[in-house]
């Protein structure tokens, strides 16, 4: 499982997330959806996938997950 | 293997309706969000519409907006575009995509669209 | 609407050139920008995810930058499969939206 890339929150997205339990805040359309399907992902021991492009940190980055965390692929979902 | 198979293209007349269909296999279509993407001839590529895993949103570009309803069947893996009072411009190849996110912490971030169909062709036209 | 503007729009180079094609966007997008490489009658491709980040399987002499309203695809030696149309496209916010292309041709 691949990490993310880098967080890239520059939007104006609430930090912490004003979503309640369950759901997620989906960035693009700026608003809570229903995330039950998600699960945590189980971290891939470091440089086991590539490099997170290096894009410059956002204001909001250092709440919720930061760049060390490892991020959960979702092809499509939501 | 991932892929998305495109079907119910074809011509049509200006007023009248067409559905398109695709069918999804090799990924957890229920768990997938999914767009309408659309080229006119010779022309830039046009988001269309997006739909969640579970239907509960759907988004709409503003030149379909009222004509078109995207929709999903994920007992059948596959993906509908309902396409309505159909014009002259809405002539192009249509194109299904899975939508590209990643979950950090509680935030869904979207990078794109990872799986294209083949594209079916719609023609309107008298 | 974010609007996206590709330049050049179309381009002439040589199998071993380094290629860049150049995406303007209307308004600050952080780095929510993609590229895709689109061949005659087939769909396009996802290259480039988040400005820079290889799509999987993607070959490594394609690489992305950028971040606000300036972004920049770059193939640092052009190989004969990589004739083709390049697009970028915006996931900031709906509508999402696509460059016009960049068309790479050989010289």
């Known amino acids: 499982m691949r990490r993310g890339p880098r967080s890239l929150r520059g939007r104006d997205a609430p930090a912490p997330t004003p979503c309640v339990p369950a759901e997620c805040f989906d960035l693009l359309v700026r608003h809570c959806v229903a995330c039950g399907l998600l699960r945590t992902p189980r971290p891939k021991p470091a440089g086991a996938s590539s490099p997170a492009p290096r894009t410059a940190l956002q204001p909001q980055e250092s709440v919720g997950a930061g760049a060390g965390e490892a991020a959960l692929p979702l092809p499509g979902l939501l | 293997e991932v892929q998305l198979v495109q079907s119910g293209g074809g011509v049509v007349q200006p007023g009248r309706s067409l559905r398109l269909s695709c069918a999804a296999s090799?990924?957890?279509?229920?768990?997938?969000?999914m767009h309408w993407v659309r080229q006119a001839p010779g022309k830039c590529l046009e988001w269309v519409a997006v739909i969640w895993y579970d239907a509960s949103n759907k988004y709409y570009g503003d030149s379909v907006k009222g004509r078109f309803t995207i929709s999903r069947d994920n007992s059948k893996n596959t993906l509908y575009l309902q396409m309505n009072s159909l014009r002259d411009e809405d002539t192009a190849v249509y194109y299904c995509?899975?939508?590209?996110?990643?979950?950090?912490?509680?935030?869904?971030?979207?990078?794109?669209?990872?799986?294209w169909g083949q594209g079916t062709t719609v023609t309107v036209s008298s | 609407e974010i609007v996206l503007t590709q330049s050049p729009s179309s381009l002439s180079a040589s199998v071993g050139d380094r290629v860049t094609i150049t995406c303007r966007a209307s308004?600050?997008?952080?780095?929510?920008l993609n590229w895709y490489q689109q061949k005659p009658g087939k769909a396009p491709k996802l290259l480039i995810y988040?400005?820079?980040s290889l799509q999987s399987g993607v070959p490594s002499r394609f690489s992305g930058s950028g971040s606000g309203t300036d972004f920049t695809l770059t193939i640092s030696s052009l190989q004969p499969e990589d004739f083709a149309t390049y697009y970028c496209?915006?996931?900031?916010?709906?509508?999402?939206?696509f460059g016009c292309g960049t068309k790479v041709e050989i010289k």
């Open positions: 090799g990924f957890t279509f229920s768990s997938s969000g």
């Open positions: 988040a400005a820079s």
């Open positions: 308004q600050s997008i952080s780095s929510y």
């Open positions: 496209q915006q996931s900031y916010s709906t509508p999402l939206t």
């Open positions: 995509a899975r939508r590209f996110t990643y979950l950090r912490g509680w935030y869904i971030e979207d990078y794109g669209l990872d799986v």
